[in-house]
Interface confidence: low
């Protein structure tokens, strides 16, 4: 058993039939010694009397808000949550496995640049009685500070018969060093509480591995005289790290016909312009990637050929 | 060719060679995203590699003030990785394929370190840890880890030389 925050405790339980559970002694936070009674949640049934209450926590019915009273007055509360462990593995019932880039990926994180700012998100089908708290650090044994905001509901989607909720959080490394080579990973820890169930999810990564630039901006076409060729030009996204002579991008330019089956012409360049042949009804798209480290490509920025 | 007594390196040549190093490092181990090596216990493997850290002067401002600190750090790292790629971690079983980019990578590390090495002036290099894994699978895992950390190292080096070529070249 451990303290999640003031007066909120998590009981770690091995979850199997007839498991012995965990014995917990609750102590009423009061100088009073006599006339103290205990109740659970909204029930008025008295569970015991005295300054301490000993309970055997085995199932969710044993969890909840324990309250000690005297003469109709509430003296203190202790909220007990359960963290289930089945066959040696902690439960992951609250969040959905996103299965990308691999199985058991519950948290996904991305950064638009090397500033030490990143966003993580996760999915759940649960709509109510749900709270998240996020902590992060650089390294674990001698952690350096990362500040995370509050997790917020960022999207709702309908998937078949189910609604899916996406939550996200923004974090910023306190003393980021964009030009350095990371040697310790960022650790992100999400505490999830649904009703009386507690779960913990973690992710560990280097910023360089979660970089995904924004798409190039100001994508423009300039037809070349007496030719089917056009000069495509674009600019670095505003959110990318500066100076660009140091934090350089490479680009992929694609000409795509109306039909998805048509052959795509692709050209790769480190410059911010390229000359391509513009076919009728085709569109030209450009995306960006860190020039020196193969993290994710940006989404495409596109313009029609006509 | 060199950086005698604190003068500038051949920024453009270094830029070209360091960008080539990036390409080679990724072609030697492209499947980085498919294997989370941090789950495989890092204790005595790649902890000891030299990292380009915040105080090493490899940021744009630090390069403008005095690029020597950074170039020395990069040189140390190049020599370190060059020794690792020439060690039995890479030469032992399982043998690398004849067309493996590791050979080219090894040669390019040496080439870039020589471009940076001042004539008659030897920067201190870091000792390479004695890593001699007994099992072939351990060797394979160690290769992945070394290449993965090399990718991060050469990315920073390439940024340094690109910025130097663009802003510090005579």
């Amino acid at each position: 058993i451990w303290e999640l925050k003031k007066d909120v405790y998590v009981v770690e339980l091995d979850w199997y039939p007839d498991a012995p559970g965990e014995m917990v002694v609750l102590t009423c936070d009061t100088p009073e010694e006599d006339g103290i009674t205990w109740t659970l949640d909204q029930s008025s049934e008295v569970l015991g009397s005295g300054k301490t209450l000993t309970i055997q926590v085995k199932e969710f019915g044993d969890a909840g808000q324990y309250t000690c009273h005297k003469g109709g007055e509430v003296l203190s509360h202790s909220l007990l949550l359960l963290h289930k462990k089945e066959d040696g593995i902690w439960s992951t019932d609250i969040l959905k496995d996103q299965k990308e880039p691999k199985n058991k990926t519950f948290l996904r994180c991305e950064a638009k640049n090397y500033s030490g700012r990143f966003t993580c998100w996760w999915l759940t089908t649960i709509s109510t009685d749900l709270t998240f708290s996020v902590k992060s650090s650089r390294g674990s044994s001698d952690p350096q500070g990362v500040t995370c905001g509050a997790a917020t509901l960022s999207a709702e989607r309908v998937r078949g018969d189910n609604k899916e909720y996406e939550y996200s959080v923004e974090c910023q490394e306190d003393s980021a060093c964009p030009a350095a080579e990371e040697s310790l990973p960022i650790e992100v820890m999400v505490d999830a509480v649904h009703k009386l169930k507690y779960e913990n999810y973690t992710s560990s990564f280097f910023i360089r591995d979660i970089i995904k630039p924004d798409p190039p901006k100001n994508l423009q076409l300039k037809p070349l005289k007496n030719s089917r060729q056009v000069e495509v030009s674009w600019e670095y996204p505003d959110t990318w790290s500066t100076p660009h002579s140091y934090f350089s991008l490479t680009f992929c330019v694609q000409v795509q016909g109306k039909s998805k089956r048509e052959k795509k012409d692709r050209v790769f360049t480190d410059k911010t312009s390229a000359t391509v042949i513009c076919r009728k009804n085709a569109s030209i798209s450009v995306r960006a990637q860190d020039r020196y480290y193969s993290s994710s490509w940006s989404e495409w920025a596109s313009v029609p050929c006509s | 060719r060199a950086v005698p007594g604190g003068s500038s390196p051949a920024w453009t040549q270094c830029q070209q060679l360091s960008q080539k190093l990036c390409t080679l490092a990724w072609s030697a181990h492209p499947l980085v995203g498919h294997m989370d090596l941090r789950e495989e216990g890092d204790e005595e493997t790649t902890n000891d590699v030299p990292h380009i850290q915040c105080g090493d002067g490899c940021d744009p401002q630090g390069l403008r003030d005095n690029s020597q600190f950074c170039l020395q750090r990069i040189h140390q790292g190049l020599i370190f990785y060059e020794k690792l790629l020439g060690s039995d971690i890479f030469t032992g079983e399982p043998s690398l394929l004849p067309d493996s980019p590791v050979g080219q990578l090894h040669a390019s590390l040496l080439g870039l370190s020589q471009l940076l090495q001042p004539e008659g002036h030897h920067w201190e290099t870091q000792q390479i840890p004695s890593l001699s894994p007994s099992q072939p699978w351990q060797r394979l895992l160690l290769r992945f880890k070394i290449l993965r950390s090399l990718q991060a190292f050469v990315a920073v080096a390439a940024r340094v030389f690109a910025h130097g070529a663009a802003t510090l070249s005579p």
Epitope: D29, S78, S140 | -
Partner: antibody, heavy 124, light 112 residues
Framework: EVQLLESGGGLVQPGGSLRLSCAAS????????MQWVRQAPGKGLEWVSS????????LYADSVKGRFTISRDNSKNTLYLQMNSLRAEDTAVYYC?????????????????WGKGTTVTVSS | DIQMTQSPLSLPVTPGEPASISCRSS???????????LDWFLQKPGQSPQLLIY???NRASGVPDRFSGSGSGTDFTLKISRVEAEDVGVYYC?????????FGQGTKLEIK
């Protein structure tokens, strides 16, 4: 300076009671879990009891469960151990120790500050 | 309960020489979050115990860097790279994975 000072030990007959105190100074007492650890003469260390920072949860070794009660008064920066039904095998030096968060999961605390101890002798 | 077994129980060492103490637990002390719940303490003669290492390998504040902790799961080691006269005393490992927290029997380090 961070300090813990135990008091209240002494000679007591089997079946008797004692109340140990541990006065804390030099840190924000109410932020830290606290524990009692004992050491019988010529023997090793034995964990006795822990109490979380707000005092709402207490944990005990089986050997003292039902006989000892750990409590704290955060306004007085003091930790207590009420020992009833004392037995000869409870004879030991009793140390109080502070639990400091280990920087990992929120429930990992290590005992980084110890008092000098107070001696409890149970004998007829 | 988790049993902790230390070896050797007595360790005579010459000053300047290295020393190594082993600690075994009857169950794994590695939490699924990747942390080992094992601490090392030193009790010098006539003094209260002092923390040396927490979480298996992290040196406590003010502990000289000649002390190091390693290991994971059920097998842990405390190493002293060069023993000094002031290192004499009894060394204990302790598991904090589950209550009751349990200590090893102690290893008495003495100077030859």
């Amino acid at each position: 300076e961070v300090q813990l000072l135990e008091s209240g030990g002494g000679l007591v007959q089997p079946g008797g009671s004692l109340r140990l105190s541990c006065a804390a100074s030099g840190f924000t007492f109410s932020d830290y879990p606290m524990q009692w650890v004992r050491q019988a003469p010529g023997k090793g260390l034995e964990w006795v009891s822990s109490i979380w920072s707000s005092g709402g949860i207490t944990l005990y070794a089986d050997s003292v469960k039902g006989r000892f009660t750990i409590s704290r008064d955060n306004s007085k920066n003091t930790l207590y151990l009420q020992m009833n039904s004392l037995r000869a095998e409870d004879t030991a030096v009793y140390y109080c120790a502070r639990g400091t968060h280990g920087g990992g999961p929120p429930w990992y605390y290590y005992m980084d500050v110890w008092g000098k101890g107070t001696t409890v002798t149970v004998s007829s | 309960d988790i049993q902790m077994t230390q070896s050797p129980l007595s360790l005579p060492v010459t000053p300047g020489e290295p020393a190594s103490i082993s600690c075994r637990s009857s169950q794994s002390l590695l939490h699924t979050h990747g942390y080992n719940y094992l601490d090392w303490f030193l009790q010098k003669p006539g003094q209260s115990p002092q923390l040396l290492i927490y979480m298996g390998s992290n040196r406590a504040s003010g502990v000289p860097d000649r002390f190091s902790g390693s290991g994971s799961g059920t097998d842990f080691t405390l190493k002293i790279s060069r023993v000094e006269a002031e290192d004499v005393g009894v060394y204990y490992c302790m598991q904090a994975r589950q209550t009751p927290y349990t200590f090893g029997q102690g290893t008495k380090l003495e100077i030859k």
